[in-house]
């Protein structure tokens, strides 16, 4: 019987058990981004593939309109990788003219939107200065951590510049979460 | 009793329960790589330490000949870090001569081989242009995500250039997976 | 019935079941670092926020004096991201003078201290040469993997240069662990 431990003689109280296979889980993969209007000073959100190829959602974890919808309160591991690629950054051009400059940058933010708080919450941020000298550059930013989420919370991935996101392969740019 | 939830009054059906401690898990660490033959247009696979130091495999997750062998179908979190190091890349030399060039790059791919699909599937890719100017450079690429795997699937880590992999320390280059 | 597997006819013995919600877990976030004395050739350890904002500890996972204390033996997923930022590295200045040099670097180490071993164990290391040309640079190093830990073990995050750590936002620099 659950709750009757073998080593200690005292009764131990546990939260209700649940099978691992029925926990909310999702792995979303990159798709070509359609330009969308976003507000000034707000990074645009990526949208995602949720059922083709490696992508899936299961056990009431749903994807809709750029958001992963959290169906059940609990602790979730959330992760994303965004691969960026671009031409030589302005920074290096300016640098060549002998004027040091604040470098260009690439940023990924995993954001939570919740009913109980008026502002979106930035859960994770990966930000990197880009001061490449070669004519083409590319690099990933990876993020992952555990957060306590509430039923109804929504998760999205925002980036500093949607036009620099590598959308060519599902293994290069992705976003996922699973209930622990 | 499992299946009898406290909140809803209706009966809920669950998959069989299982103890977390008996789930397939592995953490593999880097070893010095012996040059192996690999076919054209195919990145070479790393081989790994599976029992010394920090490395382990448990609960029927086995390692053999570059592959982690998946003993049970389910959702796995898979991760790897590869630390690369090298001398100044050709890119910077060519750049100094005033000719911009496609930069050198370093790439890590976590690949699945499955008997239900005729070609290997790239699950995760981290790829980065390398255009370093200092005489020696080093940097890690980290990857991690969740995938649905089938019993009998095989996982490996492929890299763009095995000679650039830092094999000196078990904490710098590693590969792991665990059933959620 | 738990313990009665469907495929094999023999009885299988399982470890006691336990609810996921009562497993030790922590997510710690960056705070401004007070300069502390650290020994030569030893990277300083970061200290952390453990209860405000996104940070939490639960189910007997405690934080004290730079250390996460492991309350229960088992396999843990451990992760950290440290965002570094700095001014132009010495490397690029020297390079401009025409003298190639060993580049500056940034390093993160997740370290385990255990009663049963006299030396701290480096579990994970992310190390990167920094040879930036722009006047300001910033970038994250992310680490994460699974390790078998013992009750009483202590975890910390060490960095090569505490003055380069970006402590401004809880989503940029963090440290966490959870029992699988």
């Amino acid at each position: 019987l659950k709750g009757q431990e073998f080593a200690p003689s005292h009764q131990q109280v546990y939260a209700p058990l649940r099978a691992d296979g029925d926990k909310p889980r999702a792995h979303l993969t990159v798709v070509r981004q359609t330009p969308t209007q976003h507000f000034k000073n707000q990074f645009p959100a990526l949208h995602w593939e949720h059922e083709l190829g490696l992508a899936f959602t299961k056990n009431r974890m749903n994807y809709t309109n750029k958001f992963l919808l959290i169906p059940e309160s609990g602790d979730y591991f959330i992760y994303s990788q965004v691969t960026f690629r671009g031409m030589t950054s302005e920074c290096s051009e300016i640098r060549q003219a002998g004027r040091p400059n604040k470098p260009d940058s690439i940023t990924v933010v995993i954001t939570k939107v919740t009913d109980s708080y008026p502002e979106p919450t930035q859960l994770l941020m990966g930000t990197k200065s880009v001061c490449e000298v070669g004519s083409n550059w590319f690099q990933p930013i990876y993020l992952g951590a555990m957060f306590s989420l509430q039923e109804g919370d929504k998760l999205m991935v925002n980036v500093s510049d949607i036009s620099l996101v590598d959308y060519t392969k599902e293994d290069k740019t992705f976003f996922g979460a699973f209930l622990l | 009793l499992k299946g009898q939830e406290f909140a809803p009054s209706h009966q809920q059906v669950y998959a069989p329960l299982r103890a977390d401690g008996d789930k397939p898990r592995a953490h593999l660490t880097v070893v010095r790589q012996t040059p192996t033959q690999h076919f054209k247009n195919q990145f070479p696979a790393l081989h790994w330490e599976h029992e010394l130091g920090l490395a382990f495999t448990k609960n029927r997750m086995n390692y053999t000949n570059k592959f982690l062998l998946i003993p049970e179908s389910g959702d796995y979190f898979i991760y790897s870090q590869v630390t690369f190091r090298g001398m100044t890349s050709e890119c910077s030399e060519i750049r100094q001569a005033g000719r911009p060039n496609k930069p050198d790059s370093i790439t890590v791919v976590i690949t699945k081989v499955t008997d239900s699909y005729p070609e290997p599937t790239q699950l995760l890719m981290g790829t980065k242009s390398v255009c370093e100017v200092g005489s020696n450079w080093f940097q890690p690429i980290y990857l991690g995500a969740m995938f649905s795997l089938q019993e009998g699937d095989k996982l490996m880590v492929n890299v763009s250039d095995i000679s650039l992999v830092d094999y000196t320390k078990e904490d710098k280059t590693f590969f792991g997976a665990f059933l959620l | 019935l738990k313990g009665q597997e469907f495929a094999p006819s023999h009885q299988q013995v399982y470890a006691p079941l336990r609810a996921d919600g009562d497993k030790p877990r922590a997510h710690l976030t960056v705070v401004r670092q007070t300069p502390t004395q650290h020994f030569k050739n030893q990277f300083p350890a970061l200290h952390w926020e453990h209860e405000l904002g996104l940070a939490f500890t639960k189910n007997r996972m405690n934080y004290t004096n730079k250390f996460l204390l492991i309350p229960e033996s088992g396999d843990y997923f451990i992760y950290s991201q440290v965002t570094f930022r700095g001014m132009t590295s010495e490397c690029s200045e020297i390079r401009q003078a025409g003298r190639p040099n060993k580049p500056d670097s940034i390093t993160v180490v997740i370290t385990k201290v255990t009663d049963s071993y006299p030396e701290p164990t480096q579990l994970l290391m992310g190390t990167k040469s920094v040879c930036e040309v722009g006047s300001n640079w910033f970038q994250p190093i992310y680490l994460g993997a699974m390790f078998s830990l013992q009750e009483g073990d202590k975890l910390m995050v060490n960095v090569s240069d505490i003055s380069l750590v970006d402590y401004t936002k809880e989503d940029k620099t963090f440290f966490g662990a959870f029992l699988l």
């Epitope: - | 033959q37 076919f39 696979a45 086995n62 053999t64 000949n65 570059k66 592959f67 062998l69 081989v113 499955t114 008997d115 239900s116 699909y117 005729p118 070609e119 290997p120 009998g152 095989k154 | -």
Partner: antibody, heavy 116, light 106 residues
Framework: QVQLQESGPGLVRPSQTLSLTCTVS????????MHWVRQRPGRGLEWMGR????????KYNPSLKSRVTITRDTSKNQVSLRLSSVTAADTAVYYC?????????WGQGSLVTVSS | DIQMTQSPSSLSASVGDRVTITCRAS?????MYWYQQKPGKAPKLLIY???NLASGVPSRFSGSGSGTDFTFTISSLQPEDIATYYC?????????FGQGTKVEIK
Amino acid sequence: QVQLQESGPGLVRPSQTLSLTCTVSGFDMGDTYMHWVRQRPGRGLEWMGRIDPASGHTKYNPSLKSRVTITRDTSKNQVSLRLSSVTAADTAVYYCVRSGGMPDAWGQGSLVTVSS
Amino acid sequence: DIQMTQSPSSLSASVGDRVTITCRASQGVRYMYWYQQKPGKAPKLLIYGASNLASGVPSRFSGSGSGTDFTFTISSLQPEDIATYYCQQWEGNPRTFGQGTKVEIK
């Protein structure tokens, strides 16, 4: 160049054991999976089973499971098939097949006749 | 076992015709494979993962479908396409093939 070559006796007596070997070249067998498929005269294709040469792990067609054994010898780049207690109904062309690595590859087939 | 029901069992068409073969699985599968077998030869993979063309296969061959219903198409039949075509699912144990469709030229 990827090659798979089946070999073994073309004639087997009823109730005896059919044994075939597949020798491969041009790829690392451990990176893939090796299958046996047969085709009885005028009939379709029947999957018999597969082995993961890296681990030795096998899966068999349940309809043949009690009679079929697939093994591998990675040092010789060979996979073997044994089918016990054969009858005339086991007369077929037996193919060795690679999966898990593109291109999908088949041997040319080995005709085995079961007759007294 | 997952049963694969292939239709038609044979067909006759003219050069240049569009030819369609269907395969129905008794339960849903993710991936479907299509093979071509010429007399006295081993089968050759044409389509994998339901719709991916194997290397070196002419683009007149295509595949589509998901779940239980899959279709194989030759957009413009050529004389060298005379063969028997098989569908196969690789997922359930055992792997199973359709019974084959023999394609002939009118």
